[in-house]
Every structure is written in structure tokens, then in C-alpha cells.
């Protein structure tokens, strides 16, 4: 015969524990029902009556099955310089995070204790790992054939444009500059002499440097964060 299912409240067998979503009430000496998330114990159980649960009031919550007499207070409203990423509901506390462009350098249980600006990668360096709510950007030097000419916490190293004839070779911080095709070279009928890259990659919005632009040497600089991330020693 299958064992009978006991309904709360019930006295547990000696040496056994209460079931999932139940708790042992020391006063009643019975296994009693827990309250679901979003509720709290309004009346504790007795030997003959089970726990009476009630909904959490506004601005309070319980996140777990529980038998607390009062719901927990939600944290204070997010300040104007933070972003509310999780609202206060009956089942969860509000969570405030750093404003866009910042990350949490020192977190606390719910929210952030210290926000710091996301590292910006200098020209010659691109984003290797983007920043998240809780981690800084990681920069890497642009590999041969790629460049970044911005100071940015989001830009990656991009391939140099491919030229028929190169006016100025690209480097880590500057795209290649193309020149028109040599006139001695035989051209296909109807070909247009434009200083355009051969590659069909999408064109970027930043202007192409003039041929007189001296190649930047900033890619030789150390990859230190700019600005320093929290905890780093700076440049």
C-alpha cells in the first residue's frame, strides 16, 4: 500500500525532517507550510491549524519560500546617477546598477558599492573583451593589418582597407590611404579611376587621413587604461 500523504500540520516521524516547502515549528512541534515568495507568515501554525500567509505590502518583498513574520523592505529608490535594472516587486528587491559607460568595480549584495568608468582603449588598441555591468573593458593592441584610430570603450580593431596602390600604409592606429590606380596599368573598359579600396567591406564614417598625415606612433605606447580602472595603478 502506498504511504499516506500527510497534510500540514503534522508531527514528523522521529529523526525525519519536514518536506520541501515546509518548516518545523518549535512551538507547535509540527511540520507546517512555508509561505511562497511574495508572501509572509501572518499567523503561525498550531497543532491543529496550518500557517496563514498574506501578501507582502507595497515596497516590501520575500524572494524565497519562508515563514518570516514581516516581508523585507525594498532598498531605497535608485539615485539619479544609477539605473534601476530590477524593480521592487513583492518577490524581489530593487537592484540599482551603474549608469551607462560605467561598471561596478566593487559590488554589494544587491547593487553596487563603487562604480568606475569603463576603460577606453587608445588609438592603436581595440576592445578585446567588452565591459559588462560588473567587469571593465579589456584592450588589446591591434594586430598587423588592423587598426583603431579612436579612444573608445566599444571600438574593436578593424582591417585596413585594401588598395590597388597604397599612398600611405596603414598602421595600428591609422587606416591605409589608397591612391588612384597607376595610369600605365591596363584598365578594363569603362573602369573609373577613383581612390577607392578594392575590398567591399562597409565604409566607416570617420574621414580618411590626408596623405600628409604623419603615421601615429601611439600604438607603441603601453596599453594602460585611460582612464585608470579602479584598482589599477594608472599610466
Amino acid at each position: 500500500l502506498p504511504a499516506q500523504v500527510a497534510f500540514t500540520p503534522y508531527a514528523p516521524e522521529p529523526g525525519s525532517t519536514c518536506r520541501l516547502r515546509e518548516y518545523y515549528d518549535q512551538t507547535a512541534q509540527m511540520c507546517c507550510s512555508k509561505c511562497s515568495p511574495g508572501q509572509h507568515a501572518k499567523v503561525f501554525c498550531t497543532k491543529t491549524s496550518d500557517t496563514v500567509c498574506d501578501s507582502c505590502e507595497d515596497s516590501t518583498y520575500t524572494q524565497l519560500w519562508n515563514w518570516v513574520p514581516e516581508c523585507l523592505s525594498c532598498g531605497s529608490r535608485c539615485s539619479s546617477d544609477q539605473v534601476e535594472t530590477q524593480a521592487c516587486t513583492r518577490e524581489q528587491n530593487r537592484i540599482c546598477t551603474c549608469r551607462p559607460g560605467w561598471y561596478c568595480a566593487l559590488s554589494k549584495q544587491e547593487g553596487c558599492r563603487l562604480c568606475a568608468p569603463l576603460r577606453k582603449c587608445r588609438p592603436g588598441f581595440g576592445v578585446a573583451r567588452p565591459g559588462t555591468e560588473t567587469s571593465d573593458v579589456v584592450c588589446k593592441p591591434c594586430a598587423p593589418g588592423t587598426f583603431s584610430n579612436t579612444t573608445s570603450s566599444t571600438d574593436i580593431c578593424r582591417p585596413h582597407q585594401i588598395c590597388n596602390v597604397v599612398a600611405i600604409p596603414g598602421n595600428a592606429s591609422m587606416d591605409a590611404v589608397c591612391t588612384s590606380t597607376s595610369p600605365t596599368r591596363s584598365m578594363a573598359p569603362g573602369a573609373v579611376h577613383l581612390p577607392q579600396p578594392v575590398s567591399t567591406r562597409s565604409q566607416h564614417t570617420q574621414p580618411t587621413p590626408e596623405p600628409s598625415t604623419a603615421p601615429s606612433t601611439s600604438f607603441l605606447l603601453p596599453m594602460g587604461p585611460s582612464p585608470p580602472a579602479e584598482g589599477s595603478t594608472g599610466d
Epitope: 544609477q82 558599492r113 563603487l114 568606475a116 584598482g231
Partner: antibody, heavy 119, light 107 residues
Framework: QVQLVQSGAEVKKPGASVKVSCKAS????????IHWVRQATGQGLEWMGW????????NYNEKFKDRVTMTRNTSISTAYMELSSLRSEDTAVYYC????????????WGQGTTVTVSS | DIQMTQSPSSLSASVGDRVTITCKAS??????VAWYQQKPGKAPKLLIY???TRHTGVPSRFSGSGSGTDFTLTISSLQPEDFATYYC?????????FGQGTKLEIK
């Protein structure tokens, strides 16, 4: 209400060390970062570093990192800043300060501790 | 390190005057700038943060503006209790640095 109460004035000889205390009340000590800022007589304010009493996280200003030590005694809600190898230019008022939110502008300050370095 | 350069270093004005103090950062600090007021023998008091947000209890005659590298503190109509030294501070990244101060004196 939040209060930061600092130890009294100190007179030290060059080469000595000084340890300034900052007793916190009106909030949970281990929930907030404590910063130290100094002000030489008639001069501007200079940030020395921060210390988080909840986990011993520290960030010192490079200028002071070889000479400064920030510690705490959680049981008495007190933060300490020790500056070693004192020189005359360390003569200043030393403040502890804290910020309510996660950004570093200081809404609470101690009253300041005057440290005089003189032979 | 980011340098904060304040000007002027001192300023004489009368009660009722409109006063402007400027602060220039050596590199972009977004809008992460705070302003403090300090009176002799006292700790600084926070007036403004995030360039233009007034701290609790700060009178509306104090206002801030700017972004990037150029910032301004304006007192629209000076009151006797406003004569003090004012400091800007960037709260962007470590090390947090302050301007050298502007001493506001009675004319």
C-alpha cells in the same frame, strides 16, 4: 545621523609615523567605503586613497602608496590611516570622508585631524 | 592623473552679486564633477555633484554646468554666508583630484 569623528591633533618628528583614527556612527560601518583626503595649510585638497572595511579592498593614490596604510577595527567601527616616513610637507589636516552612493563625491566628512611634522 | 585647474584663485564680490567660478579638467571627465564649499577650520561641504545636481539642502542660488573638460559653478545672488573657499573635484576615476580652490571674499 551619519557621523565621522577623528582623533586629536598630533605633532611628529621627521621620519616618524602617524596613525589617525576615524570612528563611524549612524550607519553600518562595513557597508561604506572610507576615503582619506588631506589639506596642507593654506593649500588645496588631496585624495590619498580609499579603504573598504567590509572586505579590506584598498585603492591608494600612487603618490602615497609606499608610505600609507589604511586599516580598520570593525568591532569599534573605526578606520585608521597611517602615514610613515613623515616629512615637513606632510604637515596638513587629514580628513576621513565617505560617499552615500557608488560614485565618489563626499557627502560626509570627519572634522579633520591636524598633523604637524617638525624637528 | 587628471588635473583640475580652477579660476580665478580669489575673487572679491558683494552681497547680491552673481559670481561664476570655472574649473578645467586636463582630460574628458564626462559630467563627473562635484563642487564643495569650505569655511576656515571646517571640513568641506558638498554642494553639487554630477556637474549640476544640488546636494540635499543646498540653496537653489547654487548651480553648476558644463561637460567634458569645462565646468562652472554659479552663485546667482551672493549671501553673507557664501563667503568661503570653493573647490571642484572630478569623481571620474582614481586618483580623484581637486582644483586648487577659489577664495570668495567680501568686496
Amino acid at each position: 545621523q551619519v557621523q565621522l569623528v577623528q582623533s586629536g591633533a598630533e605633532v611628529k618628528k621627521p621620519g616618524a609615523s602617524v596613525k589617525v583614527s576615524c570612528k563611524a556612527s549612524g550607519y553600518t560601518f562595513t557597508e561604506s567605503i572610507i576615503h582619506w583626503v588631506r589639506q596642507a595649510t593654506g593649500q588645496g585638497l588631496e585624495w590619498m586613497g580609499w579603504f573598504y572595511p567590509g572586505s579590506d579592498n584598498i585603492n591608494y593614490n600612487e603618490k602615497f602608496k609606499d608610505r600609507v596604510t589604511m586599516t580598520r577595527n570593525t568591532s569599534i567601527s573605526t578606520a585608521y590611516m597611517e602615514l610613515s616616513s613623515l616629512r615637513s610637507e606632510d604637515t596638513a589636516v587629514y580628513y576621513c570622508a565617505r560617499h552615500e552612493g557608488p560614485y565618489v563625491y563626499f557627502d560626509y566628512w570627519g572634522q579633520g585631524t591636524t598633523v604637524t611634522v617638525s624637528s | 592623473d587628471i588635473q583640475m585647474t580652477q579660476s580665478p584663485s580669489s575673487l572679491s564680490a558683494s552681497v547680491g552679486d552673481r559670481v561664476t567660478i570655472t574649473c578645467k579638467a586636463s582630460q574628458d571627465v564626462s559630467t563627473a564633477v562635484a563642487w564643495y564649499q569650505q569655511k576656515p577650520g571646517k571640513a568641506p561641504k558638498l554642494l553639487i555633484y554630477w556637474t549640476s545636481t544640488r546636494h540635499t539642502g543646498v540653496p537653489s542660488r547654487f548651480s553648476g554646468s558644463g561637460s567634458g573638460t569645462d565646468f562652472t559653478l554659479t552663485i546667482s545672488s551672493l549671501q553673507p554666508e557664501d563667503f568661503a573657499t570653493y573647490y571642484c573635484q572630478h569623481h571620474y576615476s582614481t586618483p580623484y583630484t581637486f582644483g586648487q580652490g577659489t577664495k570668495l571674499e567680501i568686496k
